[in-house]
């Protein structure tokens, strides 16, 4: 069983999923309002968003006393965060600016990918090997959307029997999408295009918030029970509380290299020939050059206009 990394508003903690009744370890303490969290295992980096400080920050696994600001301007409520471990990019949602943005892992070369028809975007999940990203929106028209990680091919994949879609996670091996709905109190799954939808845990969960997966087990945080729960990803059976008495459980991830499988990085050689951003794409050549917001991409599709 994995270590589970979770945000707890005032700190980030790690707990062993097999021994969850034991105390967690504080990885980064003394925070204001940590909400979303993710990591790049191969780089030894942990990222989190702080919604009070309106910032995204990072630290190194083994140097957690040293915290770096990654994005500190233009954020209002960065509720969702995801690291592209292949393309080495950072993606985030902001439910107040109603944007989904991307940048390099250090926060440079920032680009707004989506800013229209977003109401309350929250969880975001990436599948860099296929070039797709997924996000939940619990606004007036709740939905789950999918798009290319380059901002292309945006499509609503779930928009029925959905109210407060909070948690979202991907099963890379089985090619499935899992999500938790805090109003309808369930966990459902579907194919990555939204077809073949099935219930995993039917309407019995008090207030599921964030969701992750490791091997055959789903793990999620619950706001009502202040705990981390788990069940079998196929059947929903074996539902149990594995870590309780959490101050304010927010985002959660299975903290393991297994959750960030290696694959061919189409941007790996010479940044794909791109002068600035090289973003994963679902269509050949499986990457797309892009420019920071406000800077134009030249007709060669590789170079950003001078002054970027």
């Amino acid at each position: 069983a994995p270590l589970l990394l979770y945000a707890n508003r005032r700190d980030l903690r790690l707990v062993d999923a097999t021994n969850g009744k034991e105390n967690a370890t504080i990885v980064v303490g003394g925070l204001e309002d940590a909400a979303a969290v993710d990591f790049v295992f191969s780089h030894g980096l942990i990222y989190w968003s702080d919604v009070s400080e309106e910032a995204i920050k990072r630290t190194e696994f083994n140097k957690t006393e040293s915290v770096q600001n990654v994005v500190v301007s233009g954020l209002l409520s960065p509720d969702g965060l995801a690291c592209d471990w292949l393309g080495e990019k950072l993606y985030w949602t902001d439910s107040e600016t109603n944007r989904i943005e991307v940048s390099n892992l250090d926060g440079s070369l920032r680009k707004v990918l989506f800013w229209q028809e977003l109401d309350q975007p929250r969880a975001i999940a990436l599948d860099p090997s296929s070039g797709f990203m997924y996000w939940t929106d619990w606004g007036e028209v709740p939905k789950i959307e999918r798009a290319g990680m380059d901002g292309s091919s945006r499509f609503i994949i779930i928009n029925s029997e959905i109210y407060w879609p909070n948690g979202l996670t991907l099963d890379y091996e089985e090619q499935k999408l899992y999500w938790a709905d805090a109003k309808l109190n369930f966990i459902h799954k579907s194919n990555l295009d939204g077809t073949n939808r099935q219930a995993v845990v039917k309407g019995s969960l008090p207030h599921p918030f964030a969701l992750t997966l490791f091997e055959d087990i789903l793990y999620w945080t619950d706001w009502s029970t202040h705990s981390i729960l788990a069940c079998n990803k196929y059947t929903g059976e074996g539902l149990r509380e594995i870590h309780s008495d959490i101050f304010s459980p927010m985002d959660i991830h299975a903290f393991s290299q297994q959750r960030q499988p290696n694959a061919t990085n189409p941007c790996g050689i010479d940044n794909g020939g791109c002068s600035h951003l090289c973003l994963m794409s679902p269509v050949k050549p499986f990457y797309q050059c892009a420019c920071p917001t406000g800077v134009k991409l030249l007709e060669n599709g590789k170079t950003c206009k001078d002054g970027a």
Epitope: A24, G29, G30, E65, V67, H226
Partner: antibody
């Protein structure tokens, strides 16, 4: 075993400053919050604030901002509280306490008595 | 800030008697903590997160409650339980304590 050893009693003049220490032993100092609390004679407890020694982030009760400054020295596993511009209202016993991972104060220092008098 | 009001302020109980101390918050809190303090000593944790017994605390102590109303119960008073008891919340900053209940034998 876990211990928090505080510095001894202090008698200081009004307007002066004082630094109280809290030396931790028996656990990993950098991975637990240290809180500071005030107790005036015959009265209840007041929470001053916390410090997380791992990255020395702090949080203060607004009432004590400008009065108390919390610091920590990782090399000696010691937390400090500096109190400035002292008045008779600051005369009290000050406690440091470790926050257990279930968010309560599981180990306390023995208390440091501060008397402010001319 | 959240104000915690303990009642009674002072009480006495005979050995073997059941004792209940109340703690009322001026707005709803998720959990309550209880500490025991004897004269000249540091406070000692009794109950965490409303109803969990801290390490080494005798089973005669228990906690309950929710929202704005919480209580600490000693099922059978013993001489060593004579002390001052404080409730505490961390629901919002600043973390606050009740004024204390002095329990005499």
């Amino acid at each position: 075993q876990v211990q928090l050893q505080q510095s001894g009693p202090e008698l200081v003049k009004p307007g002066a400053s004082v630094r109280i220490s809290c030396k931790a032993s028996g656990y990993t100092f950098t991975t637990y919050y240290i809180h500071w609390l005030k107790q005036r004679p015959g009265q209840g407890l007041e929470w001053i604030g916390w410090i997380f020694p791992g990255n020395v982030n702090t949080k203060y009760n607004a009432k004590f901002k400008g009065k108390a400054t919390l610091t920590a020295d990782k090399s000696s596993s010691t937390a400090y509280m500096q109190l400035s511009s002292l008045t008779s209202e600051d005369s009290a016993v000050y406690f440091c306490a470790r926050e257990e991972l279930q968010y309560y104060f599981d180990y306390w220092g023995q208390g440091s008595a501060l008397t402010v008098s001319s | 800030q959240i104000v915690l009001t303990q009642s009674p302020a002072i009480m006495s109980a005979s050995p073997g008697e059941k004792v209940t101390i109340s703690c009322s918050a001026n707005s709803s809190v998720r959990f309550m903590f209880w500490y025991q303090q004897k004269p000249g000593s540091s406070p000692k944790p009794l109950i965490y997160r409303t109803s969990n017994l801290a390490s080494g605390v005798p089973a005669r102590f228990s906690g309950s409650g929710s929202g704005t109303s919480y209580s600490l119960t000693i099922s059978s008073m013993e001489a060593e339980d004579a002390a001052t008891y404080y409730c505490q919340q961390y629901h919002s900053y600043p973390w606050t304590f009740g004024g204390g209940t002095k329990l005499e034998i």
